[in-house]
């Protein structure tokens, strides 16, 4: 799985077990969602390409007091090579587009599933 995603590699590439755990966590979030996730908090949309893990963390780290995504935030920090703090933004953010956390998680989940499949069947 060293070249997961080819040229759009979301580097650094997490090992398949770690990626699988992140996907499982996102699945749990989407399945267990009763009330609006994180009270309907809005986050910056991101480009799901290279550097995606750091960008996702930069976006989600600005959501505070939402226990549902705390584990996801921790897992993403393990995939991002640099320290991320609130208010930090990379070029991967679509700065004019904000979406609900629930939609952000769904989009991220779909993309990670695709990356996982690509890694398995290479």
């Amino acid at each position: 799985l060293t070249c997961l995603g080819g040229f759009a590699s979301p580097g650094p590439v997490p090992p398949s077990t770690a990626l699988r755990e992140l996907i499982e966590e996102l699945v749990n979030i989407t399945q267990n969602q009763k009330a609006p996730l994180c009270n309907g908090s809005m986050v910056w949309s991101i480009n799901l390409t290279a550097g995606m893990y750091c960008a996702a963390l930069e976006s989600l780290i600005n959501v505070s007091g939402c226990s549902a995504i705390e584990k996801t935030q921790r897992m993403l920090s393990g995939f991002c090579p640099h320290k991320v703090s609130a208010g930090q933004f990379s070029s991967l953010h679509v700065r004019d587009t904000k979406i609900e956390v629930a939609q952000f998680v769904k989009d991220l989940l779909l993309h990670l599933k695709k990356l996982f499949r690509e890694g398995q069947f290479n």
Epitope: T17, R20, K113, K114, F116, R117, E118, Q120, F121, N122
Partner: antibody, heavy 120, light 107 residues
Framework: EVQLVQSGAEVKKPGATVKISCKAS????????MHWVKQAPGKGLEWIGG????????ASNQKFKGKATLTADKSTSTAYMELSSLRSEDTAVYYC?????FGGGPFAYWGQGTLVTVSS | DIQMTQSPSSLSASVGDRVTITCKAS??????LSWFQQKPGKAPKSLIY???RLVDGVPSRFSGSGSGTDFTLTISSLQPEDFATYYC?????????FGGGTKVEIK
């Protein structure tokens, strides 16, 4: 409703090649991996291999390397398995099976099976 | 390759009985295990995935448990339509491997 519809039974001579199809409907074809499973008469289930329909990337059981070739046509939502150099031990029912690895498992949905008989 | 050892290979039971089938993996499979039911001349049907999650539409008398290398399929109260052959499958890593099957027959 997810459906996997396989092509009909085949009778082939030893040494021949057969190509089985599996047409998927009820979901986005490229969202789930597609696998193929062999069941010889009176025997258990054996994984042949799988394909990611989005990329065409494959994974296969070493036992079937050189025997089974897996392909997928996104335009028709159809997966194919070609079996070459057929021998009597290739006589079996072959199933295609698909699903969401994380939501039901990769073998959640099954085709009805295609019986391939190899006989001279 | 990961070996899946299923036991027993066959069993006889009566309607209403509690039935337990086990599957042992040759290494830790991280609970990436499914159970299937197959009736003669039919395709297998998925019952359980991820070791303990019931597939939509499957009766609640079916349950899965276990972790690591040891897994169990339980039918709490056997019904006439449950007489069939059951298989486990590990999908933790390629090549995916099935157990040898357990035929549940009428006593």
């Amino acid at each position: 409703e997810v459906q996997l519809v396989q092509s009909g039974a085949e009778v082939k001579k030893p040494g021949a090649t057969v190509k089985i199809s599996c047409k998927a409907s009820g979901y986005t074809f490229t969202d789930y991996e597609m696998h193929w499973v062999k069941q010889a008469p009176g025997k258990g289930l054996e994984w042949i291999g799988g394909i990611d329909p989005e990329t065409g990337g494959t994974a296969s059981n070493q036992k079937f390397k050189g025997k089974a070739t897996l392909t997928a046509d996104k335009s028709t939502s159809t997966a194919y398995m070609e079996l070459s150099s057929l021998r009597s031990e290739d006589t079996a029912v072959y199933y295609c099976t698909s699903g969401d690895y994380f939501g039901g498992g990769p073998f959640a949905y099954w085709g009805q099976g295609t019986l391939v008989t190899v006989s001279s | 390759d990961i070996q899946m050892t299923q036991s027993p290979s066959s069993l006889s039971a009566s309607v209403g009985d509690r039935v337990t089938i086990t599957c042992k993996a040759s290494q830790d499979i991280n609970s990436y295990l499914s159970w299937f039911q197959q009736k003669p001349g039919k395709a297998p049907k998925s019952l359980i995935y991820r070791a303990n999650r019931l597939v939509d539409g499957v009766p609640s008398r079916f349950s899965g448990s276990g972790s690591g290398t040891d897994f169990t399929l339980t039918i709490s109260s056997l019904q006439p339509e449950d007489f069939a052959t059951y298989y486990c499958l590990q999908y933790d890593e390629f090549p995916y491997t099935f157990g040898g099957g357990t035929k549940v027959e009428i006593k």
